[in-house]
Structures are given as C-alpha cells and as structure tokens.
C-alpha cells in the first residue's frame, strides 16, 4: 500500500517500471497487474479538447478510442 512517501528525482520521469508485456502499471498501488484489471477514464466524444501530453506511465492511446483519448494503461516495459 502507498503509506510511505514516494520518491522522484526532482521533476524527472521515474525510472522504467518492468511490467511484462501483458501487464500494466497500477499507479495507485505501484505495481504491475493484468491490464484488464485497470479502468481508464471515460472515453471523450470525438472532437473533445485534446488531453495533456502523455507521461511515461499514462495510459496509451489505441485505435478505436475517441480522439486523443487514453484507452489502456501503458503495458510492457515503461
């Protein structure tokens, strides 16, 4: 559980998190889990304002999602 402080090197991106390809990184408990266990934000309608640039551990976009919408948490080696 996330009871203690987290450490980031200044404002740098964190070190890569080694999730196997079928897994995604759960940001809330900080470990790799099956991607299907995580739920991304609701799809935005086409034409909605584009989201902020993705960070290393944000969900990635996929074909079939609404314009610029995150579809799945980023799997594999992050």
């Amino acid at each position: 559980m996330r009871r203690g402080p987290r450490s980031l090197r200044g404002r740098d991106a964190p070190a890569p998190t080694p999730c196997v390809p079928a897994e995604c990184f759960d940001l809330l408990v900080r470990h790799c889990v099956a991607c299907g266990l995580l739920r991304t934000p609701r799809p935005k309608p086409a034409g909605a304002s584009s989201p902020a640039p993705r960070t290393a551990l944000q969900p990635q976009e996929s074909v079939g999602a609404g314009a610029g919408e995150a579809a799945l948490p980023l799997p594999g080696l992050l």
Partner: antibody, heavy 117, light 111 residues
C-alpha cells in the same frame, strides 16, 4: 456505462450495526477501485475506503476498526459493514467507482444512515 | 495524511463571472509526472460529479468553461463564465497517498 445502486440504509441505535450494499452494473467489480464515501448532514465529503480488483482493502484510519468493506463477485455487489455505530456516523453513504488515477467518475445515488436512539 | 485546504469556503458571484477556487495540499500530490488531484461538483441532495481529473483533464461531458491547473501542492479550478447551473459546492480530492482525502468544499452562491 457503470451504474451503482446503494441500499441498506436506515435508522439504527447507537452501538448497533448495519450493512450497506452497492449493486454494480455495466462493469465487473473485479476491475478498478470501488469506494465508499460518506457525507454527514450539511458537511463535506469523507472517504471511507476502497476495495480494489484484487480484493485488497484500504480504509480511512479513523474508521478502520469499525468499518469493513467486502464484495460478492458472483452478485457484482460491494458491501460496507458498519459496527459500533455512533451518532457522528449519521450520513449519506455513497459508493463510487474510481478510474486509473483514483478519480471517482461513477457514483451511486447514496443511502442515508441515521444513528439515533 | 495529506490535508486539503480549499479557499474560499464560500463565495457569491453573478452569472457570467469568472470564478476561481484554490486547493492547497499539505504535501505534494505529484508522482510519475502526474498530479493526483481531482475536482467535483455537488448540488444539494445529489451525488458528487467528477469535473476534472489529474489536475487539468476535463471529464467527459463536462462543459469547457471548467478548467483545472496546478501541480505539486497548489491547484486551481476555474469557471470561465458562471452559468445558473454552476451554483453548487465544489470539492478537491487527492489520491496520491492513502488515505485519499477531500477538501472541505467551496460553496458558490448567487450574488
């Protein structure tokens, strides 16, 4: 579209127990984070705790000893067992589903629990 | 626990006004380059409604007059042009660390 329906609220005497239910449809409770949030009359929101996809629970430390969150995956239903109830537990209790970032984007309508003699 | 402090606690405004609500966390709610800060709107007798997640991302279906900004410990919710349906109470919430915590709320009333 996720839909959440709470039930089980009502009047209970101090020291009593109550179990609230939250029936989910539109998604499996074995995905994501399923929360209970409460709101005392005229007050703000207070997070009670969550149960996640793996069945792991985490609670507001001020409530942990008296409140227990559980689930029945066969019924796709979330529960909040409340013991040793006090007058200050009087509140509307909401269940809410949180996304990848912990933002609660689906909420039930709430169920009122009144603790009074 | 991370304490969330909203200001003001209440405000009076008119339709068309630009409204700004601030939320300060007792420690940073940033991690992985993400701000784990969210904003909700609640009307009397109704469940809260998510407006903004991850500090600045507009929830699906929420009007574009709502926007969020900030990072670290200081965050802002802005309503660019207040509409009659926007009179409500607004809450910030952090999910950076357990236990998740809410601000005390800001009530936006009609002037």
């Amino acid at each position: 579209e996720v839909q959440l329906v709470e039930s089980g609220g009502g009047l209970v005497q101090p020291g009593g127990s109550l179990r609230l239910s939250c029936a989910a449809s539109g998604d499996s409770i074995t995905r994501g984070y399923w929360n209970w949030v409460r709101q005392a009359p005229g007050k703000g929101l207070e997070w009670v705790g969550y149960i996640n996809y793996s069945g792991t629970t985490y609670y507001n430390p001020s409530l942990k000893s008296r409140f227990t969150i559980s689930r029945d995956t066969s019924k796709n239903t979330l529960y909040l067992q409340m013991n040793s109830l006090r007058a200050e537990d009087t509140a509307v209790y909401y269940c809410a589903n949180a996304n990848y970032y912990g933002a609660m984007d689906y909420w039930g309508q709430g169920t009122l629990v009144t603790v009074s003699s | 626990d991370i304490q969330m402090t909203q200001s003001p606690s209440s405000l009076s405004a008119s339709v068309g006004d630009r409204v700004t609500i601030t939320c300060r966390a007792s420690e940073s709610v940033d991690d992985y380059g993400i701000s784990f800060m969210h904003w909700y709107q609640q009307k009397p007798g109704k469940a809260p409604k998510l407006l903004i997640y991850r500090a600045s991302d507009l929830e699906s279906g929420v009007p574009s007059r709502f926007s969020g900004s900030g990072s670290g410990t200081d965050f802002t919710l802005t309503i660019s042009s207040l509409q009659p349906e926007d009179f409500a109470t607004y809450y910030c919430q952090q999910t950076s660390k357990d236990p998740w915590t809410f601000g005390q709320g800001t009530k936006v009333e009609i002037k």
